[in-house]
């Protein structure tokens, strides 16, 4: 499929001008290659009319130009003094005309309306309001006022001052007669339809002395704004419908076959399943405008979108609307990353988040999409060292591996963590991406003790058992804080005896805290990684208490305090289940746990969003067992 995009249809009137914008992926090759506008012939082929290399056909001499905007990835063709001869099928493209790197554009130039003398022209957008003003003389002040529409050869009464309203205009038309000082009456038509367009006649009086005024009403279907976005990226539709519909339900819909427009989201709480987890409807401004953000763009998201206002929350005749034509560029600069990531309850996930590598200094964020209130996304962690209070000890955002990717690790997973998460930065908003976390059944990989109590001044040794499948991985211990997880020295104690079907390649790696102080209290993680790519983690909370008896503590799995809601095996081990979510390049030998298919099912996560949500920090551990 060609990555070139432009308007499918361009309509204009004789004598007018058009400006046609064509989009292309802004690679260095594309930015500098030839741009052209050509007319398609009946037998195929495409005859160049103008190009970026300076060629202008004699047909366009003095009335057309082509301008390239390489920084935007667009070029614009302006054509003036249009005639009906300009109607036809064209292509805008890059390179050689026959190469296929092009987009088909249909140009329709129509004859201007043949208007009667003294005709007032009203040009109004679909769904809006028009006021047709009708002057009259004093002698007709007390006589009947009326508005007719010319249908074919005959005028058809639309409204009059005696109370008649044509059924086609019921509920959306009124006739106002100004105060005695002004010799004027006006007809106001709301929620304009395309079928309202045409010639109208105002009349005051019914005899030969009546006053008449011609009006031509042109109802404009909104020209779609072209939107060119990358696959896997995001788009924002800003919808400004005007203050007159500020209190009317708003919607965004996508046109399917014919005139059908399927609701994507509306302010009445409806949301299309295909957009679950990747859409936010932002509240409207006081002028009635609102915006819709869609992330994780897919090929099938391409198409025509309309936003509008109607009490039903969907497109109806007479809805004021705005239109966009979305093109999803498959030659995306946004790298592929898993859209579904799976983790076992009690285990961890490591999610890779792409960002624009030109913005390495940008602040990184991770938020949890909530379906309530038309979609919203409370932040959970950022790269400035803030972590939402409920996530202390189990969530970390790491700048690694860098160069266009950061990592988010979430451990101690529960079913409540299932849901959609967004990767964000304060830089390029097109790089918002979405990942769904699913909680699955499974067994743990890493084994650590339950929460541990250390004694002030003594030595504490905490074990972490790694199965043989991780023999080639770097094993580490670190201390969690709200800026990350600081690596600590650890000792390889040789093969682990915690695994039944595991050979000498299993490992027991211990963390030793010498001369424990109050500062040692907190969360500790053991985990595996390869270079800057993180795999599974398991978390242990270490509490510190006053000395009771001398000596050091060597915490075995059996001796560790198991929390009440934790499973203690016959062997005395507390299992931290850690199946999943690694970078697929890293954990190729495991079953495919990073599922890159787009899926929109799965249960929602429900995270409290009370007033404590700003309180980060790493000193409160009231919610832990110790």
């Amino acid at each position: 499929k060609s990555p070139i995009f432009g308007p499918e249809e361009v309509n204009s009137v004789e004598g007018n001008s058009v400006s046609i914008t064509c989009y292309y992926p802004p690679t260095s090759v594309n930015r500098h290659t030839r741009k052209y506008w050509c007319r398609q012939g009946a037998r195929g082929g495409c005859i160049t009319l103008i190009s970026s290399e300076g060629y202008v056909s004699s047909k366009y001499a003095g009335r057309a130009n082509l301008t390239n905007f390489p920084e935007n990835g667009t070029f614009v063709v302006n054509i003036a003094q249009l005639s009906q001869d300009d109607s036809g099928r064209y292509k805008c493209g890059l390179g050689i005309n026959s190469r296929g790197l092009s987009f088909d554009v249909s140009l329709e130039v129509s004859q201007g309306p043949g208007l009667l003398n003294d005709t007032k022209v009203y040009t109004v957008d679909l769904g809006r309001t028009v006021t047709i003003n009708c002057p009259f003389k004093t002698e007709n002040a007390q006589k009947r006022k009326s508005l007719y529409k010319q249908i074919g050869l005959y005028p058809v009464l639309v409204i009059d001052s005696s109370g008649y309203v044509n059924p086609n205009y019921t509920g959306r038309i009124r006739l106002d007669i100004q105060g005695t000082g002004q010799l004027l009456f006006s007809v106001v038509i709301n929620q304009l339809r395309l079928s309202d367009a045409g010639q109208y006649l105002c009349q005051a009086g019914d005899d030969s002395n009546s006053n008449k005024k011609n009006a031509d009403l042109q109802v404009l279907k909104p020209e779609p704004e072209l939107v060119y976005e990358d696959l896997r990226g995001s788009v924002t539709f800003h919808c400004a419908l005007g203050p007159e519909v500020a209190n009317v339900a708003k919607f965004l819909c996508r046109q399917s076959s014919g005139e059908n427009c399927d609701v994507v989201v509306n302010t009445l709480g409806k949301r299309a399943p295909a957009f679950e987890g990747r859409i936010l409807l932002n509240p409207q401004d006081k002028d009635g405008s609102f915006s819709v953000v869609i992330t994780g763009l897919r090929k099938e998201d391409a198409g025509r979108y309309l936003c509008g206002a109607h009490s039903d929350g969907q497109l109806q005749e007479g809805s004021p609307i705005q239109a966009w034509q979305l093109f999803v560029n498959e030659e995306s600069t946004i790298p592929r990353s898993p859209t579904v990531v799976k983790g076992v309850a009690g285990s961890s996930v490591a999610v890779l988040c792409p960002y624009n590598r030109k913005e390495s200094k940008s602040i990184k964020y991770w938020c949890l999409w909530e379906g309530a209130q038309n979609g919203r996304c409370p932040l959970l962690v950022d790269s400035e060292g803030w972590v939402k209070a409920q996530y202390e000890g189990r969530l970390s955002l790491l700048e690694e591996p860098g160069n266009g990717t950061f990592t988010v690790i979430l451990n101690q997973l529960t079913s409540r963590d299932a849901g959609f998460y967004w990767c964000l930065t304060n830089g390029d908003t097109l790089w918002r991406t979405t990942v769904e976390i699913k909680i699955i059944e499974g067994e743990p990989n890493l084994k650590v003790p339950g929460n541990v109590t250390a004694v002030l001044g003594e030595t504490l040794k905490v074990p972490c058992h790694f199965p043989c499948k991780f023999s080639s991985y770097e094993k580490y211990w670190c201390k969690w804080n709200n800026t990350g997880c600081q690596a600590l020295p650890s000792q390889d104690e040789g093969p682990s005896k915690a695994f039944v079907n595991c050979d000498e390649n299993s490992r027991l790696v211990s963390l030793t805290l010498n001369l424990v102080t109050r500062a040692d209290e907190g969360w500790y993680w053991c985990g595996v990684k390869q270079g800057h790519f993180y795999g599974e983690t398991a978390a242990v909370y270490v509490a510190v208490e006053e000395r009771k008896a001398a000596g050091s503590r060597d915490v075995s799995l059996a001796k560790a305090d198991a929390a009440p809601d934790e499973k203690v095996l016959d062997s005395g081990f507390r299992e931290i289940e850690n199946k999943a979510i690694q970078d697929p390049r890293l954990f190729a030998e495991e079953k495919a746990v990073a599922d890159t298919r787009d899926q929109a099912d799965g249960s929602r996560a429900s995270v409290d969003s009370g007033s404590s949500e700003e309180q980060g920090g790493s000193s409160r551990h009231h919610h832990h067992h110790h």
């Epitope: 932040l379 803030w386 304060n426 700003e614």
Partner: nanobody, 124 residues
């Protein structure tokens, strides 16, 4: 955690204008929905206006629509409330608040960071 400090309050005559500022420190406010609330003597704290992370979406209480404008400058880590055509009933302590929501609808109870407030008095 973000710390918020309001300024710009004072005494003004009915029909006059004031511009309140809310300076944030501790972390950048980009990822925050920011809001203004007010509390008149003997009354509950009420919502005045809110603005999303990018500044593209705002929302106002009916009582201030068309008179007050909320804006933000993420580079300066500051939020503003421009108050025009002030009325005596606008007299209150005005509080700046922040909510760590990237986007979307945010209810009043979702605001978790608060400033100390600045007094606005409108005389008739």
């Amino acid at each position: 955690q973000v710390q918020l400090v309001e300024s710009g309050g004072g005494l003004v005559q009915a029909g006059g204008s004031l511009r309140l500022s809310c300076a944030a420190s501790g972390r950048t406010i980009y990822g925050y929905v920011m809001g203004w609330f007010r509390q008149a003597p003997g009354k509950e704290r009420e919502f005045v206006a809110r603005i999303d992370w990018s500044g593209s979406s705002t929302d106002y209480a009916d009582s201030v629509k068309g008179r007050f404008t909320i804006s933000r400058d993420n580079a300066k880590n500051t939020v503003y409330l421009q108050m025009n055509s002030l009325k005596p009933e606008d007299t209150a302590v005005y509080y700046c608040a922040g909510s760590a929501y990237y986007s979307g609808y945010v209810t009043h109870r979702d605001f978790g960071s608060w400033g100390q407030g600045t007094q606005v008095t409108v005389s008739s």
